[in-house]
């Protein structure tokens, strides 16, 4: 464990800093200049620094479970858990699920009535008795309901020609009902005759494009529990179709832009506002179904199985069955799907704030274990065989009191989890002994909490009418700085710098703004190590023989000396045994300047006066040409030929000397003077 803390001045702040942090409440644990924050550290560190084990405050997260034995059949236990959460430290508890036998079932049959489902409708009309019989094999209390859908009644989903709206079927002789989005036909009932009668009245309909408005219909079935008649039992929604589905965004094709609002809009058992709202998104529908504990069974023809299998990956607790072309196998399909659904258990929770994190370890009866998952998941769950989930809840900060529920998807049982913060320190301070705080405050977890008008570690400083802001002001460098640079205590308007636990680090300065460690490093050591230099308030002071911002250079100039032992040829300065040349001159010794302008034109008047004592500088040659020295012998260097003041050509050679603008000049004896026209 580690404890990373920032500006901790109380036990609570320490506990909030992380699960590895503990607080020492021992009196006089801090020495002069020590910050209160040194009371906050890992348990081993505090023990090592002399804090007794019973002086260490280390509240831990814990879970208390309560069983609620009232009410009927319970598949989840416990029913209530109270968690006390310390930030960063998980509290864990077990949830047991025992699948009950004969749990009541509500089954709503939602059928596509587009024209291609004509033969299916014939078979479903005879289905009522078979469906209820099949349910009664599984449960003592089964109910069935019925609804149907086609699509939104605008182009391009249906043909809006008045004749086609009256009778959308391709066969004019066929009796056919106008298209509609969703019709709730039969409320959930245990009367199979009523199912037969109501479904028997249904007529086929038709639409234009291949996908249907099934998601619209499913959303209404989930959003209208009273109208559908859902009980608080296992809820199955059989969705029978031979085609795909429209989803959010498709409404734009029919100029329907308002997003689906996920609310109930049934009037006279019809979804009359379907042309006002777009289709729901798959995620939106999945959320609504889970919220209402509805488990969809997609009964679809063979060519659509793959499509709906993809849908079940997004919708939890859903299943797909292959429907024969005429729906004759639907009862068998529902039985299989129900067995599949009820043998898979997902444990999940409602939405939580970012400050709470929940993970699940699933210990399934077949020996399979899933750890640290965002939800519990066990497959092949058998009747009366308990399975266990370990739920771990972590708070990232000191949370407000709140609660959330955990449910097994598709089942009505819930576990209510109440969450409380575990951030207070129950310190055993010397009652209300004020003597340790100069009688001007009381002890709280080893620290003096001073009365108004007093401040300081032991309330030793009287503010004397000065506000604490004024006193603190003299402990700040400026208004934007923090008190004593955050590295000391402001005691009666003066900074008392903290002692550092970093070896070799001394904090000092009027505002504790300086230390002996925050300087540039060389070879991994501050100022190159104690042999090269020392750190003073952010700057290295190098020992004799060393230089550089981190004392990284030996003070030698050997690499800067030219053959005449002139540093950087007088055209630069030596830093760290390397020349820093003046503009244009090149390393290593600032000897050449290829980019510099030719000096020839600059020195013609000097050549003229030095050699011939003529020209504009004739009278004060040495003052005008201080950097030039006349040579009587030829020199090596730049050869020049320029016109003098009399229009004669003068040839001369400039040999650069050490320094800037210093040359040895050799001037040819003869000038070339061109005679003018006579």
């Amino acid at each position: 464990q580690e404890c990373t803390k920032f500006k901790v001045s109380s036990c609570r702040e320490c506990i909030e800093s992380g699960p590895g942090c503990t607080w020492c409440q021992k009196l006089n644990f801090t020495g002069p200049g020590d910050p209160d924050s040194i009371r906050c550290d890992t348990r081993p560190q505090l023990l090592m620094r002399g804090c007794a084990a019973d002086d260490i405050m280390d509240p831990t997260s814990l879970a208390e479970t309560q069983e609620d034995h009232n009410g009927g059949q319970k598949q989840l236990s416990p029913q209530k858990v109270t968690l006390y959460l310390r930030p960063g430290q998980a509290a864990a508890f077990n949830v047991t699920f025992r699948r009950a036998k004969g749990y009541p079932i509500d089954l709503y049959y939602l059928m596509d009535l587009s024209y291609s489902m004509l033969d299916d409708l014939r078979n479903v009309k005879k289905l009522g008795g078979d469906l209820l019989r099949a349910l009664n094999e599984i449960t003592e209390s089964g109910r069935i309901g019925f609804g149907s859908f086609v699509d939104k009644t605008v182009l391009p989903f249906v043909n809006t020609h008045p004749d086609k709206l009256r009778n959308p079927c391709p066969n004019k002789e066929k009796e056919c009902q106008p298209p509609f989005a969703f019709r709730h036909v039969l409320k959930l009932t245990n009367n199979s005759n009523q199912f037969q009668t109501e479904v028997g009245k249904q007529l086929i309909s038709g639409n234009l494009d291949a996908p249907e408005g099934g998601l619209d219909a499913m959303m209404q079935v989930a959003a209208c529990p009273e109208e559908i008649g859902w009980r608080n039992v296992t809820r199955l929604l059989v969705f029978a179709t031979d085609d795909g589905f429209h989803f959010a965004g498709d409404g734009k094709l029919g100029a329907i832009l308002t997003p689906n609002d996920g609310r109930c809009h049934l009037e006279d058992n019809l979804y009359k506002r379907s042309n006002e709202f777009d289709y729901p998104s798959v995620g939106q529908l999945a959320h609504k179904l889970a919220e209402n504990n509805i488990q969809p069974i997609f009964a679809v023809t063979s060519r659509m199985v793959k499509t709906y299998e993809k849908l079940t990956e997004i919708i939890p607790k859903s299943a797909v069955g292959e429907l024969s072309e005429d729906s004759s196998n639907v009862v068998h399909l529902i039985k299989n799907a129900y067995n599949k659904l009820s043998s898979r258990v997902f444990l999940d929770h409602n939405a939580l704030p970012d400050t709470l994190k929940v993970t699940y370890d699933s210990f399934c009866s077949n020996g399979v274990t899933h750890r640290n998952q965002p939800r519990g998941d066990c497959d092949g769950v058998q009747i009366n065989v308990p399975i266990t989930f370990q739920v771990k809840v972590t708070a990232t900060e000191c949370i407000q009191e709140q609660s959330f529920v955990i449910r097994a998807l598709g089942f009505t049982d819930i576990v209510t989890v109440q969450v409380l913060p575990q951030c207070e320190c129950r310190c055993r301070d010397q009652s209300r002994d004020r003597s340790l705080c100069h009688g001007k405050g009381f002890l709280e977890c080893g620290i003096c909490r001073c009365d108004t008008g007093y401040i300081g570690k032991n309330c030793e400083c009287q503010t004397q009418g000065r506000s604490s802001q004024e006193l603190e002001g003299s402990c700040r460098k400026d208004n934007n700085s923090i008190i004593c640079s955050g590295l000391g205590d402001c005691v009666c308007g003066q900074c008392l710098c903290h002692t550092s636990d970093v070896p070799g680090k001394l904090i000092y300065g009027q505002y504790c703004e300086c230390d002996t460690i925050n300087c540039e490093r060389y070879n991994g050591q501050v100022c190159g190590g104690p042999g090269r230099g020392l750190c003073f308030c952010g700057k290295c002071r190098c020992h004799p023989g060393f230089e550089g911002s981190a004392c990284q250079c030996e003070r030698t100039t050997e690499g800067c000396l030219n053959p005449r032992r002139v540093e950087c040829s007088g055209r630069g300065r030596c830093r760290c045994n390397v020349c820093e040349c003046h503009s244009g001159y090149q390393l290593p010794l600032c000897q050449e300047c290829p980019g510099c302008p030719s000096p020839c034109g600059k020195y013609i008047s000097c050549a003229e006066c030095l050699k011939f004592e003529k020209g504009p500088f004739g009278k004060n040659c040495s003052a005008a040409c201080p950097g030039l020295q006349l040579s009587n012998n030829p020199v090596k260097g730049r050869t020049c030929k320029e016109r003098d003041s009399e229009g004669c050509w003068v040839a001369y050679t400039l040999e650069q000397q050490d320094g800037m603008d210093r040359y040895l000049i050799y001037v040819d004896e003869s000038r070339e003077c061109v005679a003018g026209p006579n």
């Epitope: 390397v578 090149q586 390393l587 290593p588 010794l589 000897q591 050449e592």
Partner: nanobody, 117 residues
Amino acid sequence: EVQLVESGGGLVQAGGSLRLSCATSGSVSSINVMAWYRQAPGKQRELVATISTSGYTDYSDSAKGRFTISRDNKNTVHLQMNSLKPEDTAVYYCRASTLRTGWLMGWGQGTQVTVSS
């Protein structure tokens, strides 16, 4: 990295001549200046002569007029030493520089020149 190998040293009578050579290998394309240094026993190392890629040469006062530095290609530099004196006795080292960093780190093993009187 550039390697420098000096050769041509030996024992010579005062007034005699020697021609030292320094061959470079490695990444030599960036070298701009080559130089000869020498170190006599118990003395500091001193720069004798330099030559740049442009042909600019520079000599110490003691070498001027007696020694000539030349470069026959980018890779080899020579020091022609005439009128040798006993005080020229030293280990002679070759050194190279780049425009970007100045003198390159490291030295060759040097070549011993001994001038007897």
